[in-house]
Amino acid sequence: FSIMENNGQPCINDDEEMKEVDLPEIEADSGCPQPVPPENGFIRNEKQLYLVGEDVEISCLTGFETVGYQYFRCLPDGTWRQGDVECQRTECIKPVVQEVLTITPFQRLYRIGESIELTCPKGFVVAGPSRYTCQGNSWTPPISNSLTCEKDTLTKLKGHCQLGQKQSGSECICMSPEEDCSHHSEDLCVFDTDSNDYFTSPACKFLAEKCLNNQQLHFLHIGSCQDGRQLEWGLERTRLSSNSTKKESCGYDTCYDWEKCSASTSKCVCLLPPQCFKGGNQLYCVKMGSSTSEKTLNICEVGTIRCANRKMEILHPGKCLA
């Protein structure tokens, strides 16, 4: 089946001056033999012999897509008129990186638009970009095979102090965002409640400013700010956080009632609803999914349900009245 129906009318291609009927006749009453498809491609309407003027359509194997004009036409001289067509990979292969780097998520193939994050062991940062996106058949930005981990200057500076602080004699003082943050540190996506805006900030600057008591700054996620579910949840989480009774420092982040600080990654991870402890007086009246009935949930349950991206409408704070 071809979408280019051939009614035998002579046609002129964009780049040709001659009509097909003007082409010199060559004895080839047998038509054209099967053409050779491009690498990773195949002939859709496959047969041994094609009539003059007949089209064949080039298709690509799964994971590849056609680039160029995908129809060949059988000419009277028994040859094929074929434009430049190739089958290009529509997925990216897992990049080969140095052993010290961890790829998340770890899979063999990645679809266009999917991203990976490169991370290093504790106390080290990626010496370059940490987030890469599959575009076409390659990674953007390109992944250098010499990419490695370097000692995190934040770790060196802080000594025995907390993140955002540095050792000054025997005591810990806040780092200066201007003086102590000239070195490279990984990007973080940060939300400023004052300006009600989010932006990408170097980790060092964010931690230094947070240490200097800038309570309006909230960590959203590691890596530069990019539209998507992670950012969406980060913003929603920030709104919910004002009512949280638990505020536990965890790496760059602060964990709330519905989260646990992962010891191995120093990241806040959402609990699952059944892990929520009943305690706490932060209650909400909600409607779940498409249900019409109201339910009273605690802040932990609300946080875990929203984190899991399940549909839920918060009707009002406090117990449901009915």
């Epitope: 949840w233 990241k267 402890f277 009943k278 984190c307």
Partner: antibody, heavy 118, light 112 residues
């Protein structure tokens, strides 16, 4: 110390019914969701059902929906699993389980064997 | 349902030897906010399962640090740096990233 003790299971005919209970101690029972997990000879470990603090929300695996009912009595610190229309594939050791902030199934009872056979 | 495939199905090792158990998922366990709900349990002979590792790599309470977990996406590994006699039993991975929660078929560890 958290303790979960399941009642004795037993041999039931296909199509028959059985009610399991789990006595909880060592923690405030009404503060936690509770669950049943089973371990069959062929299917391995399977989550069966979960119930919230007061029993107002229950969740089941697809294969037991409409046949099994999870319930609780907070005054008695007891979790139940009513199993109706039992099938041979329901043969398993049934465990009562409690979550923690570490995992959904952090604490387990010793288990009770339910055999469905004619 | 998400299928978790564990390899090998049986392991026979001498005490002190390191051990590695693989758990492969039929779909990614990384959710859209970056969380991965992958757990490891050990069921010793005649006992109930006990939690070893939660959230891929965090050690359960009271679990010896010879146990460690790693991985992301669809590939996960449990390692024991030096097996001890008390480590015998069946090791299970479990996922809670997708409903219903599912377990692997288990890897039996025996001591030579």
């Amino acid at each position: 110390e958290v303790q979960l003790v399941e009642s004795d299971g037993g041999l039931v005919q296909p199509g028959g019914s059985l009610k399991l209970s789990c006595a909880a101690s060592g923690f405030t029972f009404s503060d936690y969701y509770m669950a049943w997990v089973r371990q069959g000879p062929t299917k391995g470990l399977e989550w069966v059902a979960t119930i919230n603090y007061d029993g107002s929300s229950t969740y089941y695996r697809e294969s037991v929906k409409g046949r099994f009912t999870i319930s609780r009595d907070n005054a008695k610190n007891t979790l139940y699993l009513q199993m109706n229309s039992l099938r041979a594939e329901d043969t398993a050791v049934y465990y009562c389980s409690r979550p923690s902030t570490e995992a959904l199934f952090a604490y387990w009872g010793h288990g009770t064997l339910v055999t469905v056979s004619s | 349902d998400v299928v978790l495939t564990q390899t090998p199905s049986t392991l026979s090792v001498t005490p002190g030897q390191p051990v590695s158990i693989s758990c492969r998922s039929s779909q990614s366990l990384l959710n859209d906010v970056g969380n991965t709900y992958l757990y490891w349990y050990l069921q010793k002979p005649g006992q109930s399962p006990q939690l070893l590792i939660y959230l891929v790599s965090d050690l359960g309470s009271g679990v010896p640090n010879r146990f460690s977990g790693s991985g992301s996406g669809t590939d996960f590994t449990l390692k024991i740096s030096g097996v001890e006699a008390e480590d015998v039993g069946v090791y299970y991975c479990m996922q809670a990233s997708h409903a219903p929660y599912t377990f692997g078929a288990g890897t039996r560890l025996e001591i030579k």
